[in-house]
């Protein structure tokens, strides 16, 4: 807590400007009006304050807004955002995507901090669902964001938002998460033609059931082995040798290199040797 001291004569700040960088911490506390600071927050980021001076400015804002900062202040926090605790952020009501972007930019290049996680949680809860624009923004800053959500949280993602998802956004998703996302993706992309549909749905196929894989095998999709290896084992096991051959197309030769790994290993053990021999890959059931 900064001790309360009177502002020296002639030092009362008429505006927020660079002259304040020469103020000691106690002078900032005594001579800067919190309401003035709040209305001129958009000037703070271009003024080279020290970490200690920023602590004082935060303290002043905290005193002015004990119930949480208004969005007009939050949008211009800049580096001060990193001084906020999750407890501070839980008091905020952030509704503007522009504000969210401005704050995420401050933390760019770093792991998702507790502050950022709290901010995102508040923002998404305030919106009621993870809409396309929000998802677009969050995955741009944190490609792993989608896979950090629980299946329950993912269930609030509307199918229309799936258009914002890029393949790399799903890299760390587990099967339970893909089980939730796949039906939404199927719905989102349902009006696309065969080859275009496969390009879009491919990264979600870890949640696809057997019947959908069978349907894809009839469409000359030429699935690569990396995608095949991410399929649900229980969805792959019922596929026939002919269906897998059609599903993989020219990539079928890759099965040999993966014969000891799931789901290929388990699928091979399910097949008749005569059928496996038709592939000419030397697979042993």
């Amino acid at each position: 807590e900064v001790e309360k001291t009177a502002c020296p004569s002639g030092k009362k700040a008429p505006e927020i400007d660079e002259s304040l960088i020469f103020y000691k911490k106690w002078e900032l506390e005594a001579c800067v009006d919190a309401a003035l600071l709040a209305t001129q927050m958009d000037r703070v980021n271009a003024i080279p304050f020290t970490y200690e001076q920023l602590d004082v400015l935060k303290h002043k804002l905290d005193e002015l807004y004990p119930q949480g900062y208004p969005e007009s202040v939050i949008q211009h926090l800049g580096y001060l955002f990193l001084k906020m605790s999750p407890e501070d952020i839980r008091k905020w009501n952030v509704t503007s995507l522009e504000t969210l972007k401005a704050l995420l930019e401050v933390n760019k290049g770093h792991e998702m901090s507790p502050q950022v996680a709290t901010l995102i949680d508040r923002f998404v809860k305030g919106r009621g669902q993870l809409d396309k624009d929000t998802l677009d923004t969050l995955t741009a800053f944190y490609p792993g964001y989608l896979c950090s959500l629980s299946p329950e949280e993912l269930s609030s993602v509307p199918p229309s938002s799936i258009w914002a998802v890029r393949p790399q956004d799903l890299d760390t998703c587990d099967p339970r998460q893909l089980d939730v996302l796949y039906p939404k993706a199927r719905l989102a992309f349902q009006n696309m033609n065969g080859s275009e549909y496969f390009v879009k749905i491919q990264s979600f196929l870890g949640g696809a059931p057997t019947e959908d894989l069978k349907a894809l095998s009839q469409q000359n999709v030429s699935m690569d082995l990396a995608t095949f290896m991410k399929l649900r084992t229980d969805a792959v096991l019922p596929l026939t040798v002919a269906e897998v051959q059609k599903l993989l197309g020219p990539h079928v030769e890759g099965l040999k290199a993966e014969e000891r790994h799931r789901p290929v290993r388990d699928w091979i053990l399910r097949q008749r040797q005569d059928d496996l021999d038709t592939l000419g890959l030397g697979l042993q059931g």
Epitope: P48, E105, K108
Partner: antibody, heavy 121, light 106 residues
Framework: QVQLQQSGAELARPGASVKMSCKAS????????MHWVKQRPGQGLEWIGY????????KYNQKFKDKATLTADKSSSTAYMQLNSLTSEDSAVYYC??????????????WGQGTSVTVSS | QIVLTQSPAIMSASPGEKVTITCSAS?????MHWFQQKPGTSPKLWIY???NLASGVPARFSGSGSGTSYSLTISRMEAEDAATYYC?????????FGGGTKLELK
């Protein structure tokens, strides 16, 4: 990656005005102030002013107060500088530069390629 | 406004030679930045906040100083270091730059 793409060279008559642009990409435009710097041929660098694209707040070097007008369009992530009442003294290369506001830094860390302005009758 | 005076204005150095460029401020500043500029290109942030090397800057560069006196040093000159170097103070608006030091390869 961060990029600032400036508009092409301008040739103008004395007394005329020019408006140049600086399109930002690779970062959140509203999170950083955009500064403008002048460099006359064979000369040093002169700071003109900055704009906070989020609010439109501007701060000018007193020397350029009546010469330059800074604006920004958030929707296109573009900053603009208009120079009016041009004279031969305004012939120069003008740079936009992003200002990185971190207490360890506070510096113009990315610069545009520059817009050359030639004032000639 | 704070006036920055660089010296020398022009200098030449042989490969392997130690180079020091100085920047003197008309009043005390808390930090100094240095920019490198080669002909026909934009200035590049080279050293920030007195002594921190910007990304990609070779370790042979260093910066130091305080108050009104700052310097940039190259421990061993290399051909690619030939350029103009500008100091810039970050303490007070208007932001100001030094007049530049043109470093040539001997």
């Amino acid at each position: 990656q961060v990029q600032l793409q400036q508009s092409g060279a301008e040739l103008a008559r004395p007394g005329a005005s020019v408006k140049m642009s600086c399109k930002a990409s690779g970062y959140t435009f509203i999170s950083y102030t955009m500064h403008w710097v002048k460099q006359r041929p064979g000369q040093g660098l002169e700071w003109i002013g900055y704009i906070n694209p989020s609010s439109g707040y501007t701060k000018y070097n007193q020397k350029f107060k009546d010469k330059a007008t800074l604006t920004a369009d958030k929707s296109s992530s573009t900053a603009y500088m208009q120079l009016n009442s041009l004279t031969s003294e305004d012939s120069a290369v003008y740079y936009c530069a992003r200002y990185y506001s971190n207490p360890d830094y506070y510096a113009m860390d990315y610069w545009g390629q520059g817009t050359s302005v030639t004032v000639s009758s | 406004q704070i006036v920055l005076t660089q010296s020398p204005a022009i200098m030449s150095a042989s490969p392997g030679e130690k180079v020091t460029i100085t920047c003197s401020a008309s009043s005390s500043v808390s930090y100094m930045h240095w920019f490198q500029q080669k002909p026909g290109t934009s200035p590049k942030l080279w050293i920030y906040s007195t002594s921190n090397l910007a990304s990609g800057v070779p370790a042979r560069f260093s910066g130091s100083g305080s108050g009104t006196s700052y310097s940039l040093t190259i421990s061993r000159m290399e051909a690619e270091d030939a350029a103009t170097y500008y100091c810039q103070q970050r303490s007070s608006y208007p932001l100001t730059f030094g007049g530049g030091t043109k470093l040539e390869l001997k």
